[in-house]
């Protein structure tokens, strides 16, 4: 058993059928030594009467909040919480398996560019009496700073018969240097309470490996006299580390006609210009992507050819 | 994807062409590492992340752009002195903080090559034959000394009397290129910067 | 006293479906995961599918996949396997089980798939 | 399709020490416990070691488990006659939890 936070502890179960749990000595936080008694949650059944009560926790009807009163009034509260350790691997039930870019993740954490502050988020179908904490570490030995703000529901999508919730949260590394070369990765731990479920989730990774822009800016076309061709330009998204000569990106252009079916042209330059050659009805995307180091390309940016 | 290979102006930045050239050979040599070595520990994930040239050099901190020393964070100053006569630099833009970035990439290049030879040495001990170095990395790394050019002492390349342990060559091999892709990053960010200055 | 009580097995011809149950007492059933796990004559163990304990995630053996179902239903306190399109190769011993470090095992059902 | 190798027989005299060898991965063995299971003819399998090395209430402690990197390993110290079995190995991978995975077994004979 350990705490959580103050008056809140985790019980760690080998959960199988017929197990024999874990024997837990609350003791109730009062000066007085006489006339103590304890209930469960909202039951007015008595469990036991002095200033600590001895319980063997095996199922979630032992868990909850215990509290110890004299005479109708309340001294002191001890929630218990279960994690539940299956054929020692601890559960993750409240999240969902995202899949990507692996099994068994499930969070998932992107960044814009390399300041230190990037963006987790992950799913659950759970609608209510769900909470969530998060806390970042640069490395884990000798952690370096990592603030992250709270977790907020950013997403609501029906999946087939299901609802499905997103949560993410916006961590920043207190002294990050755009430049520096990672060794030590960033730790991502998040601790999930639903009901009285206790469950926890973490990943690790460098920042240079979640790197996403965001798509290039100011996409514009310029049409070339008596030719189909067009020059397509753009700009470096505004949050995109600077300066932009030793942040390089490279992009993509694309050709796409209003068919899915038709043929995509691709280009792939270091510029922020291009020349292609327009079909009526087609749209021109662009993507961007680090220059050097090849982690995910950002998402298009468009414009009709018309 | 290949990274696009860029063809040098006659003006253009020396050095820019062979540093692109450097990252594409230490990735495909990584990427074949990280194939051919599917049953060892050796993804991004698994390794210990190990820079050979920590405390030796400080190539991040020598070659950080103007704008970013500003950045207290990116002060994390190492005393380091260097031999400064560069042939990359054209003459009008020698600078002593350039001058000193060059060099520490130089060095960072130089103990690369020794410790990838020694390691090549012992993989071709290995009766298994699984993995060699790739000789186009090992020529890149060369050609990007020679355009360098700094004048400095051979480094002997070390040699090991005891029977080499090919599991754990082959994981030092992983770690050893994973980190100089890294630095091979740095050196390309560093490149395209003094190019475009 | 946790026990796992099988039937369903039986003789049936090839492209023929078959439902196999696995009645469960003595535990809170609906609190834990059940596997099937099969043995063909003279073969060593197969695992073939796995549900959550609120039925909300399964998982199955490549081998059976898009032909076996696994349900449950929480409220009779029993496990099933939906068995469609059985080939020969699906000959074999069925057990249910209860997943956790210590397991319980059913007695078995014996699935003949033969014309 | 079995990924964690067993032989396919250990034989021993009552009183010898028998080993039975478990070849697995870095993503099953490597990364999760092993189960080991006990089967007699025409019963269903008996579990004999959970948690790699952990022996469940009421199992004999000549039996033991041990892991080491991407192997384990059941012994039987001082073989008894009633020991003739066969024995399986079982772990997860990594990445696909809860899909089980059994060894290739290993059937015990007593000399």
């Known amino acids: 058993i350990w705490e959580l936070k103050k008056d809140v502890y985790v019980v760690e179960l080998d959960w199988y059928p017929d197990a024999p749990g874990e024997m837990v000595v609350l003791t109730c936080d009062t000066p007085e030594e006489d006339g103590i008694t304890w209930t469960l949650d909202q039951s007015s059944e008595v469990l036991g009467s002095g200033k600590t009560l001895t319980i063997q926790v095996k199922e979630f009807g032992d868990a909850g909040q215990y509290t110890c009163h004299k005479g109708g009034e309340v001294l002191s509260h001890s929630l218990l919480l279960l994690h539940k350790k299956e054929d020692g691997i601890w559960s993750t039930d409240i999240l969902k398996d995202q899949k990507e870019p692996k099994n068994k993740t499930f969070l998932r954490c992107e960044a814009k560019n390399y300041s230190g502050r990037f963006t987790c988020w992950w799913l659950t179908t759970i609608s209510t009496d769900l909470t969530f904490s998060v806390k970042s570490s640069r490395g884990s030995s000798d952690p370096q700073g990592v603030t992250c703000g709270a977790a907020t529901l950013s997403a609501e999508r029906v999946r087939g018969d299901n609802k499905e919730y997103e949560y993410s949260v916006e961590c920043q590394e207190d002294s990050a240097c755009p430049a520096a070369e990672e060794s030590l990765p960033i730790e991502v731990m998040v601790d999930a309470v639903h009901k009285l479920k206790y469950e926890n989730y973490t990943s690790s990774f460098f920042i240079r490996d979640i790197i996403k822009p965001d798509p290039p800016k100011n996409l514009q076309l310029k049409p070339l006299k008596n030719s189909r061709q067009v020059e397509v330009s753009w700009e470096y998204p505004d949050t995109w580390s600077t300066p932009h000569s030793y942040f390089s990106l490279t992009f993509c252009v694309q050709v796409q006609g209003k068919s899915k079916r038709e043929k995509k042209d691709r280009v792939f330059t270091d510029k922020t210009s291009a020349t292609v050659i327009c079909r009526k009805n087609a749209s021109i995307s662009v993507r961007a992507q680090d220059r050097y180091y090849s982690s995910s390309w950002s998402e298009w940016a468009s414009v009709p050819c018309s | 994807r290949n990274l696009p290979v860029a063809t040098p102006d006659p003006g253009m930045f020396p050095c820019l062409h062979h540093s692109q050239n450097l990252l594409r050979a230490v990735s495909n040599m990584l990427q074949k590492a990280r194939q051919t070595l599917e049953f060892y520990p050796c993804t991004s994930e698994e390794i210990d992340h190990e820079d050979i040239t920590k405390d030796k050099t400080s190539t991040v901190e020598a070659c950080l752009p103007l704008e970013l020393t500003k950045n207290e964070s990116c002060l994390n100053s190492r005393e380091t002195s260097f031999i400064t006569n560069g042939s990359c630099l054209a003459s009008r833009k020698t600078s002593f903080m350039m001058a000193l970035c060059l060099s520490s990439i130089y060095e960072d290049l130089k103990m690369y090559q020794v410790e990838f030879k020694t390691m090549n040495a012992k993989l071709l001990m290995d009766p298994k034959r699984q993995i060699f170095l790739d000789q186009n990395m090992l020529a890149v790394i060369d050609e990007l000394m020679q355009a360098l050019n700094f004048n400095s002492e051979t480094v002997p390349q070390k040699s090991s009397l005891e029977e080499p342990d090919f599991y754990k060559t082959k994981i030092k091999l992983c770690i050893l290129l994973h980190a100089f892709r890294i630095r091979a990053v740095t050196i390309d960010r560093v490149m395209s910067y003094l190019n475009a200055s | 006293q946790v026990q796992l009580v099988q039937s369903g097995g039986g003789v049936v011809q090839p492209g023929r479906s078959l439902r196999l149950s696995c009645a469960a007492s003595?535990?809170?059933?609906?609190?834990?995961?059940m596997h099937w796990v099969r043995q063909a004559p003279g073969k060593g163990l197969e695992w073939v599918a796995f549900?959550?304990?609120?039925?909300?995630?399964?998982y199955y053996a490549d081998s059976v996949k898009g032909r076996f179902t696994i349900s449950r239903d929480n409220s009779k306190n029993t496990l099933y396997l939906q068995m469609k399109s059985l080939r020969a190769e699906d000959t074999a011993v069925y057990y249910c089980?209860?997943?956790?470090?210590?397991?319980?095992w059913g007695q078995g059902t014996m699935v003949t798939v033969s014309s | 399709s079995y990924v964690l190798t067993q032989p396919p027989s250990v034989s021993g005299t009552p009183g010898q020490r028998v080993t039975i060898s478990c070849s697995g991965g870095?993503?099953?063995?490597?990364?999760?416990?092993v189960k080991w299971y006990q089967q007699l003819p025409g019963t269903a399998p008996k579990l004999l070691i959970y948690?790699?090395?952990q022996r469940p209430s009421g199992v004999p402690d000549r039996f033991s488990g041990s892991k080491s990197g991407t192997s384990a390993s059941l012994a039987i110290t001082g073989v008894q006659a009633e020991d003739e079995a066969d024995y399986y190995c079982?772990?997860?991978?990594?990445?696909?939890?809860?899909?089980?995975?059994f060894g290739t077994g290993t059937k015990v004979t007593v000399l």
């Open positions: 089980k209860t997943h956790g470090s210590h397991d319980n």
């Open positions: 549900i959550r304990y609120d039925g909300s995630n399964k």
């Open positions: 870095r993503s099953n063995i490597g990364s999760n416990t």
């Open positions: 003595g535990f809170t059933f609906s609190s834990y995961g």
């Open positions: 948690g790699n090395d």
């Open positions: 079982q772990s997860y991978d990594r990445g696909t939890h809860p899909l089980t995975m």
